[in-house]
Amino acid sequence: AVNGTSQFTCFYNSRANISCVWSQDGALQDTSCQVHAWPDRRRWNQTCELLPVSQASWACNLILGAPDSQKLTTVDIVTLRVLCREGVRWRVMAIQDFKPFENLRLMAPISLQVVHVETHRCNISWEISQASHYFERHLEFEARTLSPGHTWEEAPLLTLKQKQEWICLETLTPDTQYEFQVRVKPLQGEFTTWSPWSQPLAFRTKPAALGKDT
């Protein structure tokens, strides 16, 4: 029961996780499907159960080892297959010669915190999570600040073209509530994409001192 278009997309978090999404117009909702991973130069293989995320797409995470273990390198190729049960047999529905370091999507930055806040500026720091030591300093960040009365989509993007895990936000309004998010991307990889946005960090600027111009 397959017709129309299809897609199979996977990303490596640079350490021990490959996340996959498979979409298939006209596929049966109650079909049991899995992603199988066979690296070309490793002794292990791995399987995950595809679970529905929408009407015609399924997702799963291949957990390759402990979160911070370096399970794959730039020379690895992992054969990924989508297998769906059809009666008593498994059918191959998709296949990919997956080059992990060409298809990177890191975990969202974590541990956001306000280092210092004033009336018009705020210094914020964060950490990257489960990022390979292979990148050294070859990472970039995007940040955005949610101002009162605006949406995240309207927030201008601030680009940090180097591995800088802090930012000083300026020209803020005194005594105002803001939210801040950041995301990260390695410079390496033809199909590499941005990490998800971090959890928002809420902060409030200090009120202006009474009797002073602001």
């Epitope: 397959v2 017709n3 129309g4 299809s6 199979f8 989508v82 296949i95 990919q96 010669d97 080059k99």
Partner: nanobody, 122 residues
């Protein structure tokens, strides 16, 4: 638009051989992995073999491994499947399919040819 035209099918005795071709047009052939799939009478579609964009990596279903060989000629925009040691259970309509990228393919009627019939019978 994408066009795929299979040819080379026919009637052959068990143990015999055939070579299927798939002429591709409407897209940059070398930028896409390609697969052969087949459908036996009254059965669902079965993936047979896959080759990546530059022809350096191939994969086969267990049922055809060691008997079938997939190849491609990017200069001619043509995909091939050499079928050897044919069995009656290889009887099916054979289709070529355009992949998603240089390195991937997913079963999709939207990028499939009209097929060529292979019949293995004594």
């Amino acid at each position: 638009q994408v066009q795929l035209q299979e040819s080379g099918g026919g009637l052959v005795q068990p143990g015999g051989s055939l070579k299927l071709s798939c002429a591709a047009s409407g897209f940059r052939f070398s930028n896409y992995g390609m697969s052969w799939v087949r459908q036996a009478p009254g059965e669902g579609l079965e993936w047979v073999s896959y080759i990546n964009g530059d022809g350096s990596r191939t994969h086969y279903a267990d049922s055809v491994k060691g008997r079938f060989t997939i190849s491609r000629d990017n200069a001619k925009n043509t995909l091939y499947l050499q079928l050897n040691s044919l069995k009656t259970e290889d009887t099916a309509m054979y289709y070529c399919e355009k992949g998603l990228s240089r390195d991937g393919w997913s079963l999709s009627a939207a990028s499939r040819g009209q097929g060529t019939q292979v019949t293995v019978s004594s």
